[in-house]
């Protein structure tokens, strides 16, 4: 589908002290959706500040966010998921800044889990598998995954592979022998819904076999 910007691009609020960003999570708790917003500037005094969302809601005109330490949060079934909502920072009845946002364009998937790597001696490869809660969801079902791996000693030399399935094969000859590797995975919406990368899954660590001396090749 064509889009106007890369996934993860988000409308900025007016450049003032109350600039904020939000992300939505659909069916995050059964059929309940969530919306999380936070100020860009961590030093904003949030004591009397509230967030409110109006428009593109079912049965109600507006909803107020709950404040959870530094973030503002709503969990509800009442998102229409079509049309733009107006999200405002308020002090009392006065709106300080507002943004029109379509909640289907700021979706942040849940992090993948159960990442594992199995070495296949006969095939000379590693089979990477992981799971995602989105396979069971009804809205954000189609994701693009980003698998990142590195040799543990290479601090910032990550290799990235994008895939739409939850299984990846890494050829042994592409990896260093007798080395410890770290691997992790994250997800982003990839059909109709747009938004942000999920958090990374917990990392998985695996060791590659040593070179077979007789042939000079790896097993």
């Amino acid at each position: 589908e064509s889009g106007y910007a890369q996934n993860g691009d988000l409308e900025d609020a007016e450049l003032d002290d109350y600039s904020f960003s939000c992300y939505s999570q659909l069916e995050v708790n059964g059929s309940q959706h969530s919306l999380t917003c936070a100020f860009e500037d961590p030093d904003v005094n949030i004591t009397n500040l509230e967030f409110e969302i109006c428009g593109a809601l079912v049965e109600v005109k507006c909803l107020n966010f709950r404040k959870l330490q530094e973030i503002y949060f709503i969990e509800t079934k009442k998102f229409l998921l079509i049309g733009k909502s107006n999200i405002c920072v308020k002090v009392g009845e006065k709106s300080l800044t507002c943004k029109k946002i379509d909640l289907t364009t700021i979706v942040k998937p849940e992090a993948p889990f159960d990442l594992s790597v199995v070495y296949r001696e006969g095939a000379n490869d590693f089979v990477v598998t992981f799971n995602t809660s989105h396979l069971q969801k009804k809205y954000v079902k189609v994701l693009m995954h980003d698998v990142a791996y590195r040799q543990e000693k290479d601090e910032n030399k990550w290799t990235h592979v994008n895939l739409s399935s939850t299984k990846l094969t890494l050829l042994q000859r592409k990896l260093q022998p007798a080395a410890m590797y770290e691997i992790k995975v994250r997800s982003i919406p990839d059909h109709y819904f747009k938004g942000f990368w999920s958090e990374w899954s917990p990392s998985y660590y695996f060791r590659t076999p040593e070179i077979n001396n007789s042939s000079g090749e790896m097993d």
Epitope: E1, S2, G3, Y4, A5, D9, E11, A56, L80, L81, I82, G83, K84, K100, D102, T104, T105, K138, Y139, Y192
Partner: antibody, heavy 118, light 111 residues
Framework: QVQLVQSGAEVKKPGASVKVSCKAS????????LHWVRQAPGQGLEWMGG????????AYNQKFKGRVTMTRDTSTSTVYMELSSLRSEDTAVYYC???????????WGQGTTVTVSS | DIVLTQSPDSLAVSLGERATINCRTS??????????MHWYQQKPGQPPKLLIY???NLESGVPDRFSGSGSETDFTLTISSLQAEDVAVYYC?????????FGGGTKVEIK
């Protein structure tokens, strides 16, 4: 009130280009994407593409890629649609339309008639 | 491209009677309960006017004699009691996939 006002009718020769403008008022210009939809005489509606006034990002119907360019001027709350290499089949009324959501059109301009004739 | 087929092409209905227009799509335009189908009314010499978005949501200011229903590939626009001012061409439109396509239109007249 929310309004989209388009530029006047144009008559062009085949091979020429046309640039149609659409000025928005009554709402914050950067809050809503603006699209272009055309309608040939006695025919149905055809989506050409759209522009995000905030970023300038565009999405075009593949049918018009390479021939259509959409731009915006935030200082005047105006978007533009330029169609090049005109042919007689491009004779149509061209509408700009605001996207109230993804992607339906809740406010329309009055239309601009473009006639391509030798 | 997703093809939208409207039926009938034209419809003559008595004043006060019900008018029903159908729109069938070549593939599903629904994601669970999110139905990406919209309806417009166009009168001669005027731009289209949004009536229904998301299959069943009535646009602000549109009379409640207009209603929409359907899911997946089959959608319906209903005018419960036709008024003289409802004489127009009606179009359906999908927005699940680029390019966003319209049906060929249904002309509604008074019988």
């Amino acid at each position: 009130q929310v309004q989209l006002v388009q530029s006047g009718a144009e008559v062009k020769k085949p091979g020429a280009s046309v640039k149609v403008s659409c000025k928005a008022s009554g709402y914050r210009f950067t809050d809503y994407e603006l699209h272009w939809v055309r309608q040939a005489p006695g025919q149905g509606l055809e989506w050409m593409g759209g522009i995000d006034p905030k970023t300038g990002g565009t999405a075009y119907n593949q049918k018009f890629k390479g021939r259509v360019t959409m731009t915006r001027d935030t200082s005047t709350s105006t978007v533009y649609m330029e169609l090049s290499s005109l042919r007689s089949e491009d004779t149509a009324v061209y509408y700009c339309a605001r996207s109230g959501g993804r992607w339906y059109f809740d406010v329309w301009g009055q239309g601009t008639t473009v006639t391509v004739s030798s | 491209d997703i093809v939208l087929t409207q039926s009938p092409d034209s419809l003559a209905v008595s004043l006060g009677e019900r008018a029903t227009i159908n729109c069938r799509t070549s593939e599903s335009v629904s994601i669970h309960l999110l139905h990406l189908m919209h309806w417009y009314q166009q009168k001669p010499g005027q731009p289209p006017k949004l009536l229904i978005y998301g299959a069943s949501n009535l646009e602000s200011g549109v009379p409640d004699r207009f209603s929409g229903s359907g899911s997946e590939t089959d959608f319906t626009l209903t005018i419960s009691s036709l008024q003289a001012e409802d004489v127009a061409v009606y179009y359906c439109q999908q927005s699940i996939k680029d390019p966003y396509t319209f049906g060929g239109g249904t002309k509604v007249e008074i019988k």
